[in-house]
């Protein structure tokens, strides 16, 4: 038993890191393998992190953490009952995909304009709270040309656009993803996305 | 809400012996380290021993080395220090505290050691 | 062991001011360092862990810096339950430390 693709981790920065790598054969992940991490600190003590299978030869394994901090560096070995397969070291802070932002909302109720309002993943204890900056996807369902990104680098999860920027009569669908500049994350997955029924008044022509 | 309650302070007379307990609550007691810090009166503070989540490891202050073990009880929540051959420089208010990345965020209020004939 | 200093050892401040107090370890300490204040016949309260993170629920006027064996701690607009004693600590290597403490009181 070897590992064909080593374990590559990112962390949510706030208390879960997830852990994926292949192995070069069709393998029991929950079974076989086990992923032990440990901080780099004195009173530090080994945790065990049981993996599932992410396809045929593929493991994934979420290592819970009760805290993350700038300064943290893990230690990671995978083993195969008595056989160490595979050790390394992960720093979270360096590998960082936000979470998914969540509760997309559209109100359509606001004199022709569009407000999309989500909410923040993280608590306002949490480092990214406020470092967050988002890109906001929409697209019509009857034409898959129209699609367009709005990104938002500003802190307010929110969304501003004039309703007649869409076409009107046709539904729309929009969902948003985070993610943050001062740790050069990754992108967050995306929420979920949102449906509505775009329909405004034409301005009369003036002649 | 997490709480930790220190008691078995009191007076002692020099070369007498002390057990320390502190009940700990509102966290996973087993999964966090534990230390013991002292305050003399009107003094700084001073770091005693310290105690890893299960137990295995512990570590101390070259003042009380040889002298003081600190221990836990994971069943019950709790952590204690066995002080003997107490000097009058252990007097002192000794507070229990949760370990967070070395530092502590968590104390008890705290219990009064006095250590004089 | 290592040895942590303090500077200054008091200050007077008034409501408002900007506090900095510095704390230097005998030797590098990587960022296992913490900040805290202490009131009259109180525990103390962590401020500031692994150098630089805010516990939860402290105001944000508090900010901690530094790595290495420079370290500091800054109140950027000092409030009338900001005067207390501030202690550091390092958590680098046994025996931990702490420094001797910074009274911060009424100009």
């Known amino acids: 038993m070897k590992v064909l693709q080593e374990p590559t981790c990112v962390s949510d920065y706030m208390s879960i890191s997830t852990c994926e790598w292949k192995m070069n054969g069709p393998t029991n992940c929950s079974t076989e393998l086990r992923l032990l991490y440990q901080l780099v600190f004195l009173l530090s003590e080994a945790h065990t992190c049981i993996p599932e299978n992410n396809g045929g030869a593929g493991c994934v394994c979420h290592l819970l953490m009760d805290d993350v901090v700038s300064a943290d560096n893990y230690t990671l070995d995978l083993w195969a009952g008595q056989q160490l397969l595979w050790k390394g070291s992960f720093k979270p802070s360096e590998h960082v995909k936000p979470r998914a932002p969540g509760n997309l909302t559209v109100h359509t109720n606001v004199s022709d304009t569009l407000l999309l309002t989500w909410s923040n993943p993280y608590p306002p204890d949490n480092y990214l709270y406020n470092h967050l900056t988002y890109a906001v996807n929409i697209w019509s369902e009857n034409d898959p040309a129209d699609f367009r990104i709005y990104n938002v680098t500003y802190l307010e999860p929110s969304l501003r656009i004039a309703a007649s920027t869409l076409k009107s009569g046709i539904s729309y669908r929009a969902r948003v993803r985070a993610w943050a500049q001062c740790y050069n994350t990754t992108w967050s997955e995306w929420s979920p996305s949102t449906k509505w029924h775009n329909s405004y008044r034409e301005p009369f022509e003036q002649h | 809400e997490v709480q930790l309650l220190e008691s078995g302070g009191g007076l002692v007379q020099p070369g007498g012996s002390l057990r320390l307990s502190c009940a700990a609550s509102?966290?996973?007691?087993?999964?966090?380290?534990m230390s013991w810090v002292r305050q003399a009166p009107g003094k700084g503070l001073e770091w005693v021993s310290v105690?890893?989540?299960?137990?295995?490891?512990?570590y101390y202050a070259d003042s009380v080395k040889g002298r003081f073990t600190i221990s836990r009880d994971n069943s019950k929540n709790t952590l204690y220090l066995q002080m003997n051959s107490l000097r009058a420089e252990d007097t002192a208010v000794y507070y229990c505290?949760?370990?967070?990345?070395?530092?502590?965020?968590?104390w008890g209020q705290g219990t009064l050691v006095t250590v004089s004939s | 062991d290592i040895q942590m200093t303090q500077s200054p050892s008091s200050v007077s401040a008034s409501v408002g001011d900007r506090v900095t107090i510095t704390c230097r370890a005998s030797q590098g300490i990587s960022s296992w360092f913490a900040w805290y204040q202490q009131k009259p016949g109180k525990a103390p309260k962590l401020l500031i862990y692994a150098a630089s993170s805010l516990l939860s629920g402290v105001p944000s006027r508090f900010s901690g810096s530094g790595s290495g064996t420079d370290f500091t701690l800054t109140i950027s607009s000092l409030q009338p339950e900001d005067f207390a004693t501030y202690y550091c600590?390092?958590?680098?290597?046994?025996?931990?430390?702490f420094g001797p403490g910074t009274k911060v009181d009424f100009k």
């Open positions: 600590q390092q958590a680098n290597s046994f025996p931990f430390t």
């Open positions: 105690i890893s989540g299960s137990g295995g490891s512990t």
């Open positions: 505290a949760k370990d967070r990345r070395g530092s502590f965020d968590y």
């Open positions: 509102g966290f996973t007691f087993s999964s966090y380290a």
